[in-house]
Each structure stands twice: as C-alpha cells, then as structure tokens.
Amino acid sequence: VPLSRTVRCTCISISNQPVNPRSLEKLEIIPASQFCPRVEIIATMKKKGEKRCLNPESKAIKNLLKAVSKEMSKRSP
C-alpha cells in the first residue's frame, strides 16, 4: 500500500498478487536510491487511479514485469 509524501520509501506494505496488465494505467519502477535502499514497484490501476505496491521478489510480479515489457516492445516502432 503506497503512502505519499514520505521522505524515504513509498511502500508501507507490498503485495505478491499479480495484476491484470490490461487494467494497468501505469507501472512505476523506482530504483534504489539514497532515499530508499530498495526497488519499489507501484501499479496505478485504470479504475479510479488506485495504487498498489508490488513485491519485486514475487514470481508473479516478475512475470507481470516481463509481460508488460514484452507489450511495450511490441508497441515501439
């Protein structure tokens, strides 16, 4: 579950549950930095702009990332 306006990491809880790529508005992958020592993945859903933090270590989430990047490479000229 995301928490906005934090000075450190954004995600307070993380989910192992995959999301349907078709229901995704945006998928943010925030690399580790001086502010937050871990990678964070934040899914924004089309429905009401709902946000959800995903577990980068989860197999289901890794598969989601592969599917999304595959879809993006299809779209790029």
């Epitope: 579950v1 928490l3 906005s4 306006r5 934090t6 307070i12 809880s13 993380i14 959800r52 577990n55």
Partner: antibody
Amino acid sequence: QVQLVESGGGVVQPGRSLRLSCAASGFTFSNSGMHWVRQAPGKGLEWVALIGFDGINEYYADSVKGRFTISRDNSKNTLYLQMNSLRAEDTAVYYCARDWPEGYYNGMDVWGQGTTVTVSS
Amino acid sequence: EIVLTQSPGTLSLSPGERATLSCRASQSVSSSYLAWYQQKPGQAPRLLIYGASSRATGIPDRFSGSGSGTDFTLTISRLEPEDFAVYYCQQYGSSPPFTFGPGTKVDIK
C-alpha cells in the same frame, strides 16, 4: 487463520517504561506494514504508530513522538512498541493492526484483541 | 493534520430502520484513503469499508459507503440487532497522523 496477539501490558508508574509485543500468524508478516492504535477508557480510537513492512519507514502520532518506538522482527513475525517516559494519559487498550497489503486502498484489516496499559502511581 | 468530525454523536434507531452516519474532513481526503470501522463493546474494531465505498471481506451488503472530498457517508440499509455499535471513520494515506473520527454510537431506540 490470520491472527494478531498482543502481550506485555500491565500497571506501570509514571515515568517508567514498558514494551508491548504483537505476535502475527497466518499471513506473510514480512509483506505487511503494521500499526499500533490505542483506546483510552471510554474514549475513541487514536492512531499511535506505523512501521513499514521492512522496518525502513516509521511514523508516530505527535502525542508519543520521542517517547515511543515501533519496531519489528520479521524472522519472529513479531511487532513491538517500546514505551518510555509513560504518562497517565497513555493509559489505554493498545491494539496492533495490519495494514492491508493486497487491496488497492488502505485500511487496517486485521486487529489483535488488545492489551491494557495502566499508568498510575 | 486532517481533523475528522462525525455526526451525529449518537443515533437511536430500531432494528429494520436505515442508519445514515456522516464523516466530515477539515480538508479534502482522497476517497481512496477513507475507511470505516465498527466496534462493539469489549471487542477490537473491524474494517467495514475501505476506499470510501468498497466493502471489506465478509461485510454484508446492507453496509455501504459513499462520498468524496470532505464529506463521506456510511449507510446501513436495514439495521440488524448485531449492528448496534460504535462506528469510526479514518483518513489514511496522505501523510501521518492517520486520524480517526470521534465515532458515532448507534444504539437501540
């Protein structure tokens, strides 16, 4: 089943310390942010503190900032609240609660039964 | 800090009646971050509604939430005997503290 069990409450004198524990079971504790919420006798709910799933983020209510410390041990599936410099107004039932990890929204979806802290001379 | 005000303080109704509880915020709250809880005497609170309008797991459909911005409502369409309790709203997610409202007590007329 999903469960939170608090312990460590009791009667303590003003100015003294107490450590509360919350044992979690039935879910992936290491994925879940955790809260402490308290309720003074006959009063409403007051949010006390929050810790992120990996312990990096900590947040406190102004009323306890500098006196209380929230921590967790993911290897033991346990949440803690270290309470120092206790005051009479800290007398309350203390609940631990899970931040809902699976939904798109926030909320505290699992609560313990509470442990009572009484600060009295 | 966002302050939540709940009204009325006490609602006296009979089983089968409709209950309408109000929660007002001192500044705008994203509807994604407004929750309602039920608490019975001697028990821990229970999450009823999250995201202002979504029912939590196992919550009967007589409970519904609505609203946006600064005004939110919890409605119990037909009160059952087990619904007489205290109800709290909570704003959550902009930044701490995650304040609760003072509560509305629904008691038997």
